[in-house]
Each structure stands twice: as structure tokens, then as C-alpha cells.
């Protein structure tokens, strides 16, 4: 407990060039009689920043009216901050003395430093797509911030990730710093609609972190499953064969039919549908003439997905004598 305390609540004040800085100072007593002055630095070489009684300080204004009775707020604002303004600022109470005022009590000081906001984080994924169950790396970069202390977090669909490495450069003193972080993410089959988020928190952002995102749809390849089936119904002397290509991503797909090893150009119809998880289904129908066919017809549905090696599924056509004899409007 003391007769008078000088309260400077902020140890560190981060300011931006060109902006206005507010330096807070309150006193707990108006006694003893005497002015409150602001200085930058300590000792005999300290620089007078503001004196309420005398001098011309064009960039400095007081937050409160110092002529108001019982005023205990001696905070000041300094406008148009430049790099030359950095340093530690002290509010100092003087008491009236004879013949001149005597320094009575100093505040603990507020260090003014230039702060710079980090740039918006940029998240980059892998150059090539990878299939589920494999691990992919994402990098996040942000630049131009000061001071050096910064926090970076990774999230996948809102869940925080722990497998990442972060570096802040340079390690020594600098006007501005950069951060780079690499996160390792295991892909799940349902990750087409997933997102990874890089979140950067810095003192200059006032509790409102910056976020960068990347869609896992850019990094994942979900290979299709194939199923070839013969439709029980016959249309005249033709049999309908279906090739169902399920759960693939991305959409890029080439489908070809082969009849006993010979590629066929004809394809009756096809449909593309999107699943809830963002993957696609492709259904292709192929009509086979059976009037002049032998019984050993082998149909192959071949799929080339996203530039990968082709996968295929074969079906040996079952054509009974009874089917061959039926008229075109009959139902088998």
C-alpha cells in the first residue's frame, strides 16, 4: 500500500505505423500536489513526451480533461505513429517543491512496439491425389507479422489435428516474421467433402484469428467399384447388360464395353449421379444382339478413372434357347 500509485496497466502496447497509440495511466490519489508528466526512457537522457502545464506537443492529446476536478486519468494519445516512436513510456508524478517540482513516483512503464498483422494464411495441399487410408501433407504459410509470438492450429472438419510441425523465421530479431507449418492428414473414404483449416492467432488480431482452408476433394482419389449384371428382361432379340461404377471421385471417368475382346463403340445409355458424401455413381447400359449369337458371349466393362490404370469386370452372357426363340414383345 502506498500514498500514491501510478497505474500503467499495459506492459506492452503494439501499434501500427500511421495509427494512434493510447498510453494509459491512472493515479490512486490526487495528493501530493503536482503535475503528471510523460517521458520516454529513464535517466537523465529521458525524453519529455507530455507536460500538462507547459510546452507544445502537437501529436499528443489527453484522454480525459486534466482540468476537471478529481480527474485521476492521465492517459494520453499519440497520433501518426512512426518507427521512431518505439520505446518505453512512463507517466511520472511530481510533487510541488521549493524551488522546483520534485519527482515523486513513476509508473512501471509501457513498452510501445510496432505490431504488424500476419497475412491471410495460405494452405497448399499435395501435388497429386492420393487414395483413402494414405497420409497427405498440407502446408500453411503466413508472413509479415510482428512481434514473433504467434499461435498456429490445424483442424479437419472442426477437429483439431496434432500431427504437424511449425517453424517461425527468422529466429533472431527482425522487423517482421513468417510462419510455415506442415500437417499430416490421413485420408478417409468420405473426405471428398472434408476441409482442413489452418488457424493463426496473433496479438495484433485482437482475438479474431485468421483462417486458411483447403478442400480434401483436391487431394483425394476414391477408386470405383465395378459390377456388371445382365438384366432378366429381353427386348426383342437383345439383352440389356448394366455396368455399375460406384463411389468414385473425381468425376473424370472413361468407360468402354468389349464383346469377346472386341471394343464396341455403341452404348445405349448412361447416367451419372452424385452421392451424399460427394462421390459419384455411373451406370452404363449395353444392348447385345442374341439372334445370331453363340452361347459363349463375354462382355467386359472397362473403366479408366482419373488417368489411373484401367479396371474391368467381365460377364459371360447367359442366353438360353428359350430366350432365343421368344418374340420381341414377350417377357422372359
Amino acid at each position: 500500500e502506498e500514498e500514491l500509485q501510478m497505474i500503467q496497466p499495459e506492459k506492452l502496447l503494439l501499434v501500427t505505423v500511421g495509427k494512434t497509440a493510447t498510453l494509459h495511466c491512472t493515479v490512486t490519489s490526487l495528493l501530493p500536489v503536482g503535475p503528471v508528466l510523460w517521458f520516454r526512457g529513464v535517466g537523465p537522457g529521458r525524453e519529455l513526451i507530455y507536460n500538462q502545464k507547459e510546452g507544445h506537443f502537437p501529436r499528443v492529446t489527453t484522454v480525459s480533461d486534466l482540468t476537471k476536478r478529481n480527474n485521476m486519468d492521465f492517459s494520453i494519445r499519440i497520433s501518426s505513429i512512426t518507427p521512431a516512436d518505439v520505446g518505453t513510456y512512463y507517466c511520472v508524478k511530481f510533487r510541488k517543491g521549493s524551488p522546483e517540482n520534485v519527482e515523486f513516483k513513476s509508473g512501471p512503464g509501457t513498452e510501445m512496439a510496432l505490431g504488424a498483422k500476419p497475412s491471410a494464411p495460405v494452405v497448399l495441399g499435395p501435388a497429386a491425389r492420393t487414395t483413402p487410408e494414405h497420409t497427405v501433407s498440407f502446408t500453411c504459410e503466413s508472413h509479415g507479422f510482428s512481434p514473433r509470438d504467434i499461435t498456429l492450429k490445424w483442424f479437419k472438419n472442426g477437429n483439431e489435428l496434432s500431427d504437424f510441425q511449425t517453424n517461425v523465421d527468422p529466429t533472431g530479431q527482425s522487423v517482421a516474421y513468417s510462419i510455415r507449418s506442415t500437417a499430416r492428414v490421413v485420408l478417409d473414404p468420405w473426405d471428398v467433402r472434408s476441409q482442413v483449416i489452418c488457424e493463426v492467432a496473433h496479438v495484433t488480431l485482437q482475438g479474431d484469428p485468421l483462417r486458411g482452408t483447403a478442400n480434401l476433394s483436391e487431394a483425394i482419389r476414391v477408386p470405383p467399384t465395378l459390377e456388371v449384371t445382365q438384366q432378366p428382361m429381353r427386348v426383342g432379340n437383345q439383352v440389356n447388360v448394366t455396368c455399375q461404377v460406384r463411389k468414385f471421385y473425381p468425376q473424370s471417368l472413361q468407360l468402354t464395353w468389349s464383346e469377346n475382346g472386341n471394343v464396341c463403340q455403341r452404348e445405349t445409355a448412361s447416367t451419372l449421379t452424385e452421392n451424399k458424401d460427394g462421390t459419384y455413381n455411373w451406370t452404363s447400359w449395353f444392348l447385345v444382339n442374341i439372334s445370331d449369337q453363340r452361347d459363349d458371349v463375354v462382355l467386359t466393362c472397362q473403366v479408366k478413372h482419373d488417368g489411373q490404370l484401367a479396371v474391368s469386370k467381365r460377364l459371360a452372357l447367359e442366353v438360353t434357347v428359350h430366350q432365343k426363340d421368344q418374340s420381341s414383345d414377350a417377357t422372359p
Epitope: 500500500e1 500514498e3 495528493l31 503535475p35 502545464k53 486534466l66 482540468t67 476536478r69 480527474n71 515523486f104
Partner: antibody
Framework: QVQLQESGPGLVKPSQTLSLTCTVS????????VNWIRQPPGKGLEWIGI???????DYNAALKSRVTISKDTSKNQVFLKLSSVTAADTAVYYC????????WGQGTTVTVSS | DIVLTQSPASLAVSPGQRATITCRAS??????????MHWYQQKPGQPPKPLIY???NLESGVPARFSGSGSGTDFTLTINPVEANDAANYYC?????????FGGGTKVEIK
Amino acid sequence: QVQLQESGPGLVKPSQTLSLTCTVSGFSLTGYGVNWIRQPPGKGLEWIGIIWGDASTDYNAALKSRVTISKDTSKNQVFLKLSSVTAADTAVYYCARAGKMDYWGQGTTVTVSS
Amino acid sequence: DIVLTQSPASLAVSPGQRATITCRASESVDSYGNSFMHWYQQKPGQPPKPLIYLASNLESGVPARFSGSGSGTDFTLTINPVEANDAANYYCQQNNEYPWTFGGGTKVEIK
């Protein structure tokens, strides 16, 4: 709680030095100043001087040549010395805390007489 | 030195009435937006008790019947309503300039 207590000889011979002690409790002498004030019998109050927390002093110019205020922070004591006393220095002597004089001792009576 | 002149020198008031004491300074006691004038109550055989600081601020524990006003050179202590135990000497004091000085006192008696 805050307390101040004056002590010293009740009788001092003329031309001698009056020495009083103010023992304080409930606050620190490094954080607060202590005043000395006196009151001659049946008269008003007269400020003698103050010793601040940093041990600097300010005195009433009318008494400055004869007054010394000092302190021993470790013992929580403030001292008043008034030299070359005369009968006009007969008074109740008070010590009071700080510029606000918010706490006072009970006072000690000093008579200057041969 | 700043001379503080109190008036009246003595005052007799009935309980429930208002008592007004004035203190005039030979020069302004205002500095840095405040009036460095204080009021004390002293009863016989006791040390002064602070009532008002900085012209108008009530010390903690002091009844709201006591109030202070004024600035510059003219100050007033008001007791309203007066009670029997308010009988005492009242002093104004300035600590705007050295030497710090007290007024000559006003004796308040209860009728």
C-alpha cells in the same frame, strides 16, 4: 489498522533540542509520508514539515533553520528534532500520515521551561 | 505564505439547524484542476479528525451531514443538520503551496 504514536520528553529546557519520535504501524514509511504539526495551548495548528516516502523533506520556512525530520524505516519510526527551543515552542506535537493527513497520533505535550 | 482566514471565529447553532463556516485564502489554492483545501474537526483533548479533502470530498466514515464546496480562494464547510456531538473546533488547511497552512479555526457551539 493504521496507527501513529508520538513519544518524547515532556519538558525541555530553553536553548536545548527537542527530540520526538513517531512510531507508526499499519502502513509502510517507504510508501507514505509523515508530517509533524504542533498546536500551542489554546491556539491553532502549525505545520512543521514532512518526510516523504523517499526520505526527502519539506519544512516550514519559519522553522527550517531549527528543524530536522528523519526516519528509520526498519523500525517504523519518524524523528523530529527542533533546536534552540524557547517558551514559544511549548505545544502539543502531532505526527500525521501523508499529504492528506488522514491519520493522526494522539499528540504529545512538550513544555519548554527552565 | 498563504494565509487562511476563517469566519466566523465562533458560532452557536441549534440542533437540526445548518452551520456554515467559510475559509478565505490569501491566494488561490487551485492546481491541476483541483482545490487543495481540506477541513478538520478537533474536539478538546483530541487530535484533529479529517472531514473533507480536496474541497468537496467526504472522508470515509464521515456523515453526509458534512459537505464542502468552493474553489480558488473561497471555501465553505456546511453541517446540515447540526447534531449535539458536532460541538468542536473546525480548521481549514491548504497544501497547495509551502508552507502548508491552517486557518485560525472556528468554534462551533450547540445551543
